[in-house]
């Protein structure tokens, strides 16, 4: 089980539940945009594959400044096992690629997607 | 409700080089990805490139020494320029929203025909 | 290069089941995206990513992909859907690009 830090539903949340809820939030952020996704700050590309979670969060967390994507990194907090912290960097980053949050938020949208209907939750 | 058109000469000489402009209008062009497609006639569908509003492009590699695409977020146009122009490059070319959520494209413009003939 | 592979034609009936595919490396790992295009208009979205539907988009469109090959399915086919359908993939590698198949024409006999 997975515990969301700073979500309003108190106790553990499936994992099942905050996959879709993440998904939800990230096609939320991307509808009617009025200007570019945290003014189209780049950041890490990732590998999608295992530890992700962690991976992603450790790309978004060097973005300051940007309250559209607050509740992604929230919602990633409670994904990732571990602690993670601006600067830091695991082997899942493609490190000679830097790319806009808004296409790193598809890419990641798409995968999770992907995860989504194959049932893999974990 | 966003529209796209697309404009520019009908007719170009060999050689020569395309400017085509696209005028969004219904929403705000500078919080997408912008792409130019091309359609010979009786021909599947080409990417030519896409650019953001950062002005960050990525270009077709087989036509990339030809491409040149900018972005015009105050009169919310985007532009195409294509040069040494040669008959095979005869084509409705359209301008297109990559959507917000994914790699897709979401509005289309009605398309402008071009064809290189001297 | 990334090369999708679709076929030219597709023939069925009204009321039947259509299904058009799509071939590619692996594309099971990449969002396909479809497009329908009628004589002489812009291509319309009908799936993305694999087998969502934009809003005002029959539920008669569906989608699938996985392995080698996305389908595109429409079901209870009408007249009004004879049209060229096309798939779509971004390639994101060190050179990022769009890739369209080459087209597959749907008739309704």
């Known amino acids: 089980l997975t515990c969301l830090g700073g979500f309003a539903s108190p106790g553990p949340v499936p994992p099942s539940t905050a996959l879709r809820e993440l998904i939800e939030e990230l096609v939320n952020i991307t509808q009617n945009q009025k200007a570019p996704l945290c003014n189209g700050s780049m950041v890490w590309s990732i590998n999608l594959t295992a530890g992700m979670y962690c991976a992603a969060l450790e790309s978004l967390i060097n973005v300051s400044g940007c309250s559209a994507i607050y509740r992604t990194q929230r919602i990633l907090h409670g994904l990732c096992p571990h602690k993670v912290s601006a600067g830091q960097f695991s082997s899942l980053h493609v490190r000679d690629t830097k790319i806009e949050v808004a296409q790193f938020v598809k890419d990641l949208l798409l995968h999770l997607k992907k995860l989504f209907r194959e049932g893999q939750f974990n | 409700q966003v529209q796209l058109q697309e404009s520019g000469p009908g007719l170009v000489k060999p050689s020569e080089t395309l400017s085509l402009t696209c005028s969004v209008s219904g929403g705000s062009i500078s919080s997408y990805y912008w792409s130019w497609i091309r359609q010979p006639a009786g021909k599947g569908l080409e990417w030519i490139g896409r650019?953001?509003?950062?002005?960050?492009?990525n270009y077709n590699s087989s036509l990339k020494s030809r491409v040149t695409m900018s972005i015009d977020t105050s009169k919310n146009q985007l532009s195409l320029k294509l040069s040494f122009m040669t008959a095979a490059d005869t084509a409705v070319y359209y301008c297109?929203?990559?959507?917000?959520?994914?790699?897709?494209?979401?509005?289309w413009g009605q398309g402008t025909l071009v064809t290189v003939s001297s | 290069s990334y090369v999708l592979t679709q076929p030219p034609s597709v023939s069925v009936a009204p009321g039947q089941t259509a299904r058009i595919t799509c071939g590619g490396n692996n594309i099971g790992s990449k969002g396909v995206h479809w497009y329908q295009q009628k004589p002489g208009q812009a291509p319309v979205l009908v799936v993305y990513d694999d087998s969502d539907r934009p809003s005002g988009i029959p539920e008669r469109f569906s989608g699938s992909n996985s392995g080698n090959t996305a389908t595109l399915t429409i079901s209870r086919v009408e007249a009004g859907d004879e049209a060229d359908y096309y798939c779509?993939?971004?390639?994101?590698?060190?050179?990022?690009?769009?890739?369209f198949g080459g087209g597959t024409k749907l008739t309704v006999v």
């Open positions: 297109a929203r990559e959507s917000g959520s994914s790699y897709s494209y979401d509005y």
């Open positions: 650019i953001y509003m950062t002005g960050r492009t």
């Open positions: 779509q993939v971004w390639v994101s590698s060190s050179d990022h690009h769009v890739v």
